[in-house]
């Protein structure tokens, strides 16, 4: 069965900047992905990044930069504006559109005790959706 | 297919302001995240800047920052542009177009003419 | 900014010949991430707003004959038409798909002897 696995980090030098990392664990070639905070896609989440293989990556603030690390794993760079961190206790979730196997999405956050530059650990489930 | 529906042809004096309409009919997310484009007679393709229905937030060319607003509206599935001070650069044919530019609207014509 | 130069401004060939444009960009649109370039190619019929051709620097889109064929990587690519038909007298644009802002080339306009 395939996985999305999603890690939120804090960049150890900048504490306003955040970095969600999703990858796809399973056959079949990505199509698309979103990235979403506040809930899944779909239901409750907005949209922060899109990313397609070929066509290109499209990110709103307050994401920086989305990019592919791999073929089958994604970044985005965030970029914390207030004074307060309104990340630290969100939601960020990817989903991920692969060929044949439909969409599966999965959601992650940074962990309330989490040092600067330590990733909150893989959480492939409770939300491991497919459609 | 998505379908992309223009408003019509705008004659505007210099100084004025103007909203450029498009009307997106599609059946998967992508076709509601829109961009824009400038094209001056005879000239190439310009990005003025795109926009997101969940966010309602737009990313800019900074060479169309203070002239064109970006807006959405998620529940009617129709993108805006706004033009503010209308100059005779202005005048050009304006094109919406999908997030990755895969569909694309008919046009607007903008004339700025006294 | 990201410059696109497209080459040549114009081309008059007659209908079954083979034709080559170019478009070279000031910075790589290679995302190395996924090896993938993100460079896309647009054809622009008079009076029409422009198609999406190619996309991935070599990917055509659905629906588009398989006389055209896009390639290059980095930032030399070139847009070739193996048979030129009647129907493809239009504008082709080159854009990079890969940083914002998202700029065009000049384009290459293509005539048909």
């Known amino acids: 069965t395939p996985e999305v696995w999603v890690q939120v980090q804090m960049e150890a030098t900048e504490l306003s900047s955040f970095t969600v990392h999703c990858g796809f664990l399973g056959p079949g070639s990505i199509s698309l992905v979103t990235v979403s905070w506040g809930g899944p896609d779909g239901a409750g989440g907005t949209k922060l990044a899109v990313l397609h293989p070929e066509l290109g990556t499209r990110q709103w603030a307050p994401a920086r930069q989305a990019r592919w690390e791999t073929q089958s794993s994604i970044s985005l760079a965030l970029e914390d504006s207030g004074a307060s961190s309104p990340f630290a206790n969100t939601t960020f979730c990817c989903k991920f559109a692969s060929f044949p196997e439909g969409s599966w999405e999965s959601c992650g956050s940074l962990p309330p005790s989490s040092d600067p530059g330590l990733s909150a650990p893989p959480t492939p489930v409770p939300i491991l959706r497919a459609d | 297919e998505v379908q992309l529906q223009q408003s019509g042809p705008e004659v505007v004096k210099p100084g004025a302001s103007v909203r450029i309409s498009c009307k997106a009919s599609?059946?998967?997310?992508?076709?509601?995240?829109i961009n824009w484009v400038k094209q001056s007679h005879g000239k190439s393709l310009e990005w003025i800047g795109d926009?997101?229905?969940?966010?309602?937030?737009?990313n800019y060319n900074q060479k169309f920052k203070g002239k064109a607003t970006l807006t959405v509206d998620k529940s009617s599935g129709t993108a805006f542009m706004g033009l503010r001070s209308l100059t005779s650069e202005d005048s050009a044919v304006y094109y919406c177009a999908t997030l990755f530019f895969d569909n694309w609207g008919q046009g607007t014509t903008l004339t700025v003419s006294s | 900014d990201i410059v696109m130069t497209q080459s040549p401004s114009s081309l008059n060939v007659s209908a079954g010949e083979k034709v080559t444009m170019s478009c070279k960009s000031s910075q790589s649109l290679l995302n190395s991430g996924n090896q993938k370039n993100y460079l896309a190619w647009y054809q622009q019929k008079p009076g029409q707003p422009p198609k999406l051709l190619i996309y991935?620097?070599?990917t055509r889109e659905s629906g588009v004959p398989d006389r055209f064929t896009g390639s290059g990587s980095g930032t030399d690519f070139i847009l070739t038409i193996s048979s030129v038909q009647a129907e493809d007298l239009a504008l082709y644009y080159c854009?990079?798909?890969?940083?914002?802002?998202?700029?065009f080339g000049g384009g290459t306009k293509l005539e048909i002897k």
């Open positions: 926009v997101n229905p969940d966010s309602n937030g737009a």
């Open positions: 599609g059946n998967t997310f992508t076709d509601f995240f």
């Open positions: 854009q990079n798909a890969h940083s914002s802002p998202y700029t």
């Open positions: 991935g620097a070599s």
